[in-house]
Amino acid sequence: TLNSVLNSNAIKNLPPPLGGAAGHPGSAVSAAPGILYPGGNKYQTIDNYQPYPCAEDEECGTDEYCASPTRGGDAGVQICLACRKRRKRCMRHAMCCPGNYCKNGICVSSDQNHFRGEIEETITESFGNDHSTLDGYSRRTTLSSKMYHTKGQEGSVCLRSSDCASGLCCARHFWSKICKPVLKEGQVCTKHRRKGSHGLEIFQRCYCGEGLSCRIQKDHHQASNSSRLHTCQRH
């Protein structure tokens, strides 16, 4: 199970895949209908980044996309890979780094207003590798346009924070990305150790509200690194 990877204050280290060598990049195997989980069930918390299993592009960080680490690899074995820079080859928009999109197999720059459609109007259904397309990339489901006219309420599925009503942000909540409340003073928050790690969590918290920052709680300064509690505090 994914229990021990759910600590949202940790970077994750995958075990080798089933039958794989210890030095091989970690990968995911399909363990149950619609759910991806690692080849073994032991995760360790480490400071250096390791590959993260995924079923959808949206489960990866903003500078990553979800694909098989080997060409022509099994569709069930997918991890988050670094996005492709401008002029690099691509197969779909999500492969290109932010500010670019895939045109005629090449990542090209997108001007701000021109390209809002395909990526933003779709959302994935988490763990959905039971609906993979022929090219091995998970099927996307288009959200009803109704959702884009009405701002999402707490708990409703979303693609980005602008889909959510005021005071809410769009964050992963195990099974999907949903609108959650922006954190208030004193609430537990997540301090990210590396840029982009927010996209790697299966449970995400929103950011701290205006005038607040995520800092170590004073009475937790003596605690060990792994158990330090961060809360939203006044600047």
């Epitope: 199970t1 229990n3 619609g34 109704k146 309420q153 409703s156």
Partner: antibody
């Protein structure tokens, strides 16, 4: 306000079938995952099944896998649970619940009794 | 399988504070910060009281608070009132069984 109303419970013999329904109102049904949770008489809560907002992803507890099927009709704002090959141990109050931030709204439940 | 252990019963007098514990293995409650609490009055549906360990949904009294230390999550009810008498369930999440509940704790207000 959010409202969930279950129906379809009743007395059924072991091996029999039953279909539960849950009518949802007061929120955009098609924007939420939904679940069924059950509670045997005098016992604790047990998650049974969950379904994604469009219905293309479904998940089940091991105890009901292969016997129960969860589905939804977003045009009718209704969640369903088709229960086949029922056993005595399936006797419980069945709740439908919205998967917002966790199980944030629940119906009042419908009693399913499996007995000969 | 994940198991969350709760005391079968706790009791307290009106105005007092009580704490209900929920202990899990290191791979569930202790392995991450996510625990929720539900209240269930006899013959009624459960109600979400706490999510993400310590956050109250709107409409829930601030007399209810949650915390976590190591492998144990706790629900504290301060200024105990007669209407708090109910069953309380902790819940965590598992990738295969989604929602996992503790066995429940019966709170009696003396």
């Amino acid at each position: 306000q959010v409202q969930l109303v279950e129906s379809g419970g009743g007395l059924v013999q072991p091996g029999g079938s039953l279909r539960l329904s849950c009518a949802a109102s007061g929120f955009t049904f098609s924007s939420y995952w939904m679940s069924w949770v059950r509670q045997a008489p005098g016992k604790g809560l047990e998650w049974v099944s969950g379904i994604s907002y469009s219905g293309s992803n479904t998940h089940y507890a091991d105890s009901v896998k292969g016997r129960f099927t969860i589905s939804r009709d977003n045009s009718k704002n209704t969640l369903y649970l088709q229960m086949n090959s029922l056993r005595a141990e399936d006797t419980a109050v069945y709740y439908c619940a919205r998967m917002g931030i966790d199980l944030d709204y629940w119906g009042q439940g419908t009693l399913v009794t499996v007995s000969s | 399988d994940i198991a969350l252990t709760q005391p079968a019963s706790v009791s307290g007098s009106p105005g007092q504070s009580i704490t209900i514990s929920c202990t899990g293995t290191s791979s569930d409650v202790g392995g991450f910060n996510y625990v929720s609490w539900y209240q269930q009055h006899p013959g009624k549906a459960p109600k979400l009281m706490i999510h993400d360990g310590s956050n109250r949904p709107s409409g829930v009294s601030n007399r209810f608070s949650g915390s976590k230390s190591g492998n144990t999550a706790s629900l504290t009810i301060s200024g105990l009132q007669a209407e708090d008498e109910a069953d309380y369930y902790c819940q965590t999440w598992d990738s295969l069984s989604f929602f996992v509940f503790g066995g429940g704790t019966k709170l009696t207000v003396l």
